[in-house]
Amino acid sequence: HSDGIFTDSYSRYRKQMAVKKYLAAVLGKRYKQRVKNK
C-alpha cells in the first residue's frame, strides 16, 4: 500500500485515517464473526 507519491502533512493524515478505518473494519468483522460463532 504505497498510496501515492506525496509526503505532505495532508497526504500523510489521509493515509493514517485510511489505515485506522481499515483496521477498525477488519477488527469489527472479526469481532462479529466471533460473536456469531459462539
Epitope: 501515492g4 489505515v19 478505518k21
Partner: antibody, heavy 111, light 111 residues
C-alpha cells in the same frame, strides 16, 4: 501515464449508473483515487475518494447516493437516485491531491 | 461543508504582468496548509499546479506561486504568458474530508 473514465451516457431520472476509471502506465492499486464532477459551464465539485485500502470518504452533499469502490485495476463510481442536477462531466484523478486527471465522461440525466 | 470563495471572474492581465487570485475558506484547512490550486482550459481536465498551499507540482513553471495559511490563500502568476489564460480553482482539504470542496473558479484573461 494516464487515467480514463468510461460509462457516461444519457439516462432517465432515477436510473442507476456506474462509471469506471482505468489507467495506462500506472499501477492504480498503489494510489488513492478521487472523483470530481463538473456541470456544463459550471465549476468543479469534489465527490469523494478511495484509499489503497479501499476505505472511502465522500463530500457531505453525497448523502449515500454515490459509492466508490475499487479492484486492482479499476476504480468505480456507482450512482443512484440520479436527477437532472447530476448532469455533468465526471472525472477520476490520482492521489488525494488529484495530480493526474482523466479526460472525463459525460453523464446526462434527462427525461 | 466548507465554502471556498475565490476572486470574482474575470481577472485581466497583460502579457508579462502579474495576476493575483485569492481563495478564502469558511474554516481552516487541515494543518493550515491543505490547499491546492488547479488550472483548467476549455475542453480539458484540470491540471494540478500547487499543493500543500505552496508546493509546486511536478513540471509546473516557477512563475506560479502559492502562499497563505489557515483560511486565506493566494495564487500569484508572475510574468503572465498567453498560455496562462484559463480558469483557476482552489481545493481545500479538511480534518473531516466530508468538508472538502473547490472554490467557484476564477477566469484569467490575458491581453
Amino acid at each position: 501515464q494516464s487515467v480514463e473514465e468510461s460509462g457516461g451516457r444519457l439516462v432517465t431520472p432515477g436510473t442507476p449508473l456506474t462509471l469506471t476509471c482505468t489507467a495506462s502506465g500506472i499501477d492504480l492499486s498503489g494510489y488513492a483515487m478521487g472523483w470530481v464532477r463538473q456541470a456544463p459551464g459550471k465549476g468543479l465539485e469534489w465527490i469523494g475518494d478511495i484509499s489503497t485500502y479501499g476505505t472511502t470518504d465522500y463530500a457531505s452533499w453525497v448523502n449515500g447516493r454515490f459509492t466508490i469502490s475499487r479492484t486492482s485495476t479499476t476504480v468505480t463510481l456507482k450512482m443512484t437516485s440520479l436527477t437532472t442536477e447530476d448532469t455533468a462531466t465526471y472525472f477520476c484523478a490520482r492521489d488525494y491531491w488529484l495530480s493526474l486527471w482523466g479526460p472525463g465522461t459525460l453523464v446526462t440525466v434527462s427525461s | 461543508a466548507a465554502v471556498l470563495t475565490q476572486t470574482p471572474s474575470p481577472v485581466s492581465a497583460a502579457v508579462g504582468g502579474t495576476v493575483t487570485i485569492k481563495c478564502q475558506s469558511s474554516q481552516s484547512v487541515y494543518d493550515n496548509n491543505a490547499l491546492a490550486w488547479y488550472q483548467q482550459k476549455p475542453g480539458q481536465p484540470p491540471k494540478l499546479l500547487i499543493y500543500a498551499a505552496s508546493t509546486l507540482a511536478s513540471g509546473v513553471p516557477s512563475r506560479f506561486k502559492g502562499s497563505g495559511s489557515g483560511t486565506q490563500f493566494t495564487l500569484t502568476i508572475n510574468g503572465v504568458q498567453c498560455d496562462d489564460a484559463a480558469t483557476y480553482y482552489c481545493l481545500g482539504g479538511y480534518d473531516d474530508p466530508a468538508d472538502n470542496a473547490f472554490g467557484g473558479g476564477t477566469e484569467v484573461v490575458v491581453k
